[in-house]
């Protein structure tokens, strides 16, 4: 079918980085700058996307594949590709459409970003408190009370865990 | 690719516990809070609570508080959600769900769903 | 708790634009989302943060959010958007979803 293919449409053997020049009698030309094509066949090269002001260049457009952008310092990426900026804020804080908040008590944000989140409920699970929480931590459970009884073994908190996060795709 | 793929079906008496699987696969699975969230036969969807698979903090629905316990096995990417008590109105489909990373705690992946069948 | 409410149903023309609504005390104050479920599919993302798109997710689908209603809005509506529609926010501690409404295409 490939082959058929290629014998009727001349388009499909230009390959990514080029495109089919309807102009110069379909013959595979290379994109020109500041343009891409990923994949073979293409009848047109996309625009290169352009990171600017907020955003950063994480990787250089390339004949073959567009630009991709990250967030200068203080902001973070939102949204597929890091299609928006979103404002940092410091651990123990939300950000809010009225700008950075601290977190209430009772809750907590280890994170620049999200949300504050309420201390884990330690007894709904079963378990005790090991380490209180704090603005910018979760409490840390440890075994159920009824491990906690005189003659067991003592228990090492462990390291406060960090937070789900991740950097931009 | 990414998903999440739930356990399968479930048929359970009033008064049993049920355990439901959510194993996620093409993601950086630590990295983003997992949610549980029911729906009975024509009805909306409930938020049952959520568990954080790094440190494994959970926060729970007041409505479900001591009836559902949500736990996860890091080594194998799963979340589970264990409701006891059965009674007939939790006849429902259960989906686990991602949060993703915007401001507000959006759901940005689904499990398939669940269906548990609470019936003497 | 914090209460959101849906429009049970919506009709609107093949072509034409639809808007559901979602009311809740100053929900202009928290972060809207949306999410489209067809029967016997699980819910899917359509409109995150009051306005954005997840990618993947058609132009025609929008949201605005400002005082005490958040709206989502499908223009040229096609057969294919007919389905459940749920808003959600977070309210202090708990993830909060409308009643949902049902789309009906014409």
């Known amino acids: 079918f490939e082959r058929t293919r290629s014998l009727q449409d001349p388009c499909s053997n230009c390959p990514a980085g080029t495109f089919c020049d309807n102009n110069r009698n379909q013959i595979c030309s290379p994109c020109p700058p500041n343009s891409f094509s990923s994949a073979g066949g293409q009848r047109t090269c996309d625009i290169c996307r352009q990171c600017k002001g907020v955003f950063r260049t994480r990787k250089e457009c390339s004949s073959t594949s567009n630009a991709e952008c990250d967030c200068t310092p203080g902001f973070h990426c939102l949204g597929a590709g890091c299609s928006m900026c979103e404002q940092d804020c410091k651990q123990g804080q939300e950000l809010t459409k009225k700008g950075c908040k601290d977190c209430c008590f009772g809750t907590f944000n280890d994170q620049k970003r999200g949300i504050c989140r309420p201390w884990t409920n330690c007894s709904l699970d079963g378990k005790s408190v090991l380490v209180n929480g704090t603005k910018e931590r979760d409490v840390v459970c440890g075994p159920s009370p009824a491990d906690l009884s005189p003659g067991a073994s003592s228990v090492t908190p462990p390291a406060p865990a960090r937070e789900p996060g991740h950097s931009p795709q | 690719q990414m998903q999440l793929v739930q356990s399968g079906a479930e048929v359970k008496k009033p008064g049993a516990s049920v355990k439901v699987s959510c194993k996620a696969s093409?993601?950086?699975?630590?990295?983003?809070?997992m949610h549980w969230v029911r729906q009975a036969p024509g009805q909306g969807l409930e938020w049952m609570g959520w568990i954080n698979p790094m440190a494994g903090g959970t926060n729970y629905a007041q409505k479900f508080q001591g009836r559902v316990t949500i736990t996860r096995d890091t080594s194998a990417s799963t979340a589970y959600m264990e409701l006891s008590s059965l009674r007939s109105e939790d006849t429902a489909v259960y989906y686990c769900?991602?949060?993703?990373?915007?401001?507000?705690?959006?759901?940005?992946?689904w499990g398939q769903g669940t269906l548990v069948t609470v019936s003497s | 708790s914090y209460e959101l409410t849906q429009p049970p149903s919506v009709s609107v023309a093949p072509g034409k634009t639809a808007r559901i609504t979602c009311g809740g005390n100053n929900i202009g104050s928290k972060s809207v989302h949306w999410y489209q479920q067809k029967p016997g599919q699980a819910p899917v993302l359509v409109i995150y943060?009051?306005?954005d798109r997840p990618s993947g997710i058609p132009e025609r689908f929008s949201g605005s959010n400002s005082g005490n209603t958040a709206t989502l809005t499908i223009s040229r509506v096609e057969a294919g958007d007919e389905a459940d529609y749920y808003c959600?926010?977070?309210?202090?501690?708990?993830?909060?979803f409308g009643g949902g409404t049902q789309l009906t295409v014409l």
């Open positions: 943060y009051d306005s």
């Open positions: 093409g993601y950086n699975w630590t990295g983003y809070y």
């Open positions: 769900a991602r949060e993703g990373w915007a401001r507000g705690v959006e759901l940005d992946m």
């Open positions: 959600q926010v977070w309210d202090s501690s708990s993830v909060v």
